[in-house]
Interface confidence: medium
């Protein structure tokens, strides 16, 4: 019996087609992805093959103005329209709190939403009961397939799930649910989840009875043969893991942003054992037409977005200096504003020892593309912020050793004075440079804001200590020459859309007046 698994993950609000790098579509003839194009391909496969499941491994939420405006209603609507069969909860599904998940998505989705390792407690338990499930048995042709869900146990550090959801260890939580499916005579089981490729592989190895793992969170691109676009494969598709009980378990992921549709064909024997698996992600490029009815629906929903982008988010009473003449040479108040917003967006998980789990921000000055003039009645709009941060990136959470941070700050000024983009703006950091010294030895003082303290204060950076830092995904991926971050980071979790982070902060503050205050000397 043959099953076709179509899968997406980390779509992050890319409802419309995008450019090849998943930013805003400029030249339509070269654009990719989007739900209208995805629907065309899905329908084509559904018509051609008998047993097809369309699955999503989480993080539909967060990433473009679509999510900012519609807050998840767009996810439910278009996933319903595409007739998804199941979805696993990702960490970003909690970005607007539990209510922001329950109302727009859990209550409106026509497909099961899954996570076996999230347990509700207290008053939330009855409110959320039945709205998401640990597993679901889906009829496919004449057979049934069990889908068990899982979500990153780091979600409390990455999003806003509140205090009434407990995120258990994935493997510990999955095993009893898989065992339960076995007792129901379900012998074909897919683990669908959002914990990253390393955890996906562990699940394949450790959870007895899981036949296939469909993952997300790490934006992993797997491919067999010559890759069709810019993404470099992290391994073959499917990636085969030998389980502890000797089975060959295929593990798949489909990069991110709806650029690819994962396509995996699995052959099962009559006892539910995987006989063979093969496939590849399908690049959703312009050779695949956009479905006209979905496209018309997208255009209809789009109208509200255009209007939103010109509405006032808040006011500034000072000039927001985002000029390259400032931000690539010295501390600029636009950089301070953005870093303050980045930290504010990550205020979570305080306890009696830590005032917050992260206190530091770094931001490449070259990523700040425009100032905002306060003389326009002080008004700040989404449109203004899109000019400042036009690349559609995210502000991510990484863990780095102090020694890596020191290298990053040396790189920041290694060719100072040439108006290059690597000059770092900061938050929760005081750095002193001596530019008379030779490149690679210019950082003379580097103090960082403590987290394990009741009164935050600046302490000297410790080379062997592990620090959490918020930074643009561009830097986490080694952009602007920050190869040491990419090579040496100990953990990387994707965060919220850059403009959304700043716009939320400005809306919260209502009136802003960031200063140049001696963070960089």
């Amino acid at each position: 019996w043959e099953l076709t698994i179509l899968h997406t993950n980390d779509v992050h609000s890319r409802l419309e087609q995008t450019s090849e790098d998943s930013s805003k579509c400029v030249n339509a003839s070269r654009c990719m992805g989007g739900v209208a194009r995805l629907f065309t391909k899905v329908q084509q496969i559904r018509r051609a093959e008998p047993n097809v499941l369309l699955l999503d491994a989480g993080d539909q939420y967060q990433g473009t103005i679509w999510f900012t405006v519609y807050k998840g209603a767009e996810v439910a609507h278009f996933m319903n329209a595409l007739r998804y069969d199941a979805m696993a909860l990702g960490n970003h599904e909690f970005d607007n709190g539990v209510e922001g998940l329950i109302e727009p998505l859990l209550k409106e989705a026509k497909f099961p939403i899954l996570s076996a390792n999230i347990k509700a407690k207290g008053p939330l338990a009855s409110q959320i009961s039945g709205l998401y499930l640990p597993y679901k048995v889906l009829p496919v042709g004449d057979e049934v397939v069990g889908i068990v869900g899982y979500t990153s146990k780091e979600t409390p550090f990455l999003s806003n799930p509140g205090t009434n959801l407990v995120f258990e260890d994935e493997i510990t939580a999955l095993q009893p649910e898989v065992d339960k499916l076995k007792t129901l005579n379900v012998n074909k089981i897919i683990a669908l989840g959002h914990s990253g490729f390393e955890t996906d592989k562990l699940i394949a190895q450790k959870v007895r009875g899981v036949d296939v793992v469909v993952g997300g969170h790490s934006n992993t691109f797997l491919y067999t043969g010559n890759p069709p676009s810019k993404e470099v494969p992290a391994g073959k598709y499917p990636f085969i893991v030998t389980s502890d009980d000797g089975r060959k378990v295929p593990v798949v992921q489909a990069y991110a942003f709806g650029k690819y549709l994962g396509y995996l064909k699995i052959e099962f024997d009559e006892r539910g054992n995987v006989i063979s698996s093969h496939g590849n992600p399908i690049l959703l490029n312009s050779s695949i037409p956009e479905d006209p009815s979905i496209k018309a629906d997208i255009n209809k929903w789009r109208i509200k977005l255009d209007n939103y982008s010109t509405q006032e988010l808040g006011k500034t009473i000072v000039y927001l200096d985002g000029s390259s003449q400032s931000c690539r040479f010295r501390e600029c108040n636009m950089g301070n504003l953005i870093c303050d917003a980045m930290i504010n967006n990550n205020l979570r998980h305080a306890d009696e020892m830590f005032w917050n789990h992260v206190s530091m921000c770094i931001l490449n000055g070259g990523g700040i593309r425009s100032p905002i003039d306060e003389r326009n009645n002080g008004t700040i709009t989404w449109e203004n912020l899109a000019a400042v941060l036009p690349f559609g990136g995210t502000f991510d959470l990484v863990q780095l050793k102090g020694s890596t941070l020191k290298k990053a700050f040396e790189h920041s000024v290694h060719r100072y004075g040439q108006s290059t983009g690597e000059f770092l703006q900061v938050g929760g950091i005081h750095v002193v440079y001596d530019l008379s010294r030779k490149p690679g030895d210019r950082v003379v003082k580097l103090d960082v804001l403590c987290t394990k303290c009741r009164v935050p204060s600046y302490d000297p950076l410790k080379m062997d200590e592990i620090y959490k830092v918020i930074l643009p995904n561009f830097l986490a991926n080694g952009g602007d020459g920050f190869q040491m971050i990419k090579d040496e980071l100990l953990r990387h979790d994707s965060g919220d859309q850059d403009i959304n982070v700043v716009s939320t902060y400005i809306s919260k503050m209502k009136v802003i007046y960031p200063a140049v205050e001696g963070r960089i000397k």
């Epitope: 998840g72 209603a73 109302e103 209550k107 929903w301 109208i303 509200k304």
Partner: antibody
């Protein structure tokens, strides 16, 4: 082809009840929000009630709140309006229309398809 | 409640002429405004949504404009089949319709 067909209208005395139905075809009914709109003889249009695709959210005009109940049976592709405590001013043609709230009302859609309407007359 | 006011109540126009219908909202509805056409004995038909986007199958002679509180429906050259009642509708917060404008033959 999208079709909406209302039924259940008629003459009813003040204080009485009536249940309207709207049979939908030609689209995935459960994906879409639905509404009721009425039009008194010789008058303009008045929105009455709306329901989300999975019936998790319902909305009513103030003039009918507490008296009318909107519901849907997605397995039968049918929308309903239960009207109780009817008054003379409820006399109208009642239209079923495709469109309404999504995501608990964060997005309201326009009415792109309408039924032909069913006449409700409240008179003694 | 958002109140929608249409003017004029009746508009007398000769075939081939231009007709301009107005709709005013009591508070801003952004671009969440639709126009419907209704002929005697028929259900309304969606013409324009998003203040200016023509619905599927609607001829180009119908155009909408405006945002916030002031909106206009223009029929560039009236055809015989265009004589009808036109309603505006806001859909920012639930729904409210205007009282209608009857376009009649002059």
């Amino acid at each position: 082809e999208v079709q909406l067909l209302e039924s259940g209208g008629g003459l009813v005395q003040p204080g009485g009840s009536l249940r309207l139905s709207c049979a939908a075809s030609g689209f995935t009914f459960s994906n879409l929000a639905m509404s009721w709109v009425r039009q008194a003889p010789g008058k303009g249009l008045e929105w009455v009630s709306a329901i989300s695709g999975r019936a998790t959210s319902t909305y009513y005009a103030d003039s009918v709140k507490g008296r009318f109940t909107i519901s849907r049976d997605n397995s039968k592709n049918t929308l309903y309006l239960q009207m109780n405590s009817l008054r003379a001013e409820d006399t109208a043609v009642y239209y079923c229309a495709r469109g309404g709230p999504y995501g608990s009302g964060s997005y309201w859609d326009t009415f792109d398809y309408w039924g032909q309407g069913t006449l409700v007359t409240v008179s003694s | 409640e958002i109140v929608m006011t249409q003017s004029p109540a009746t508009l007398s126009v000769s075939p081939g002429e231009r007709a301009t219908l107005s709709c005013r909202a009591s508070q801003s509805v952004s671009s969440n405004l639709a126009w419907y056409q209704q002929k005697p004995g028929q259900a309304p038909r969606l013409l324009i949504y998003g203040a200016s986007t023509r619905a599927t199958g609607i001829p180009a002679r119908f155009s909408g404009s405006g945002s916030g509180t002031e909106f206009t429906l223009t029929i560039s050259s009236l055809q015989s089949e265009d004589f009808a009642v036109y309603y505006c509708q806001q859909y920012t917060n639930h729904y409210t319709f205007g009282g209608g404008t009857k376009v009649e033959i002059k």
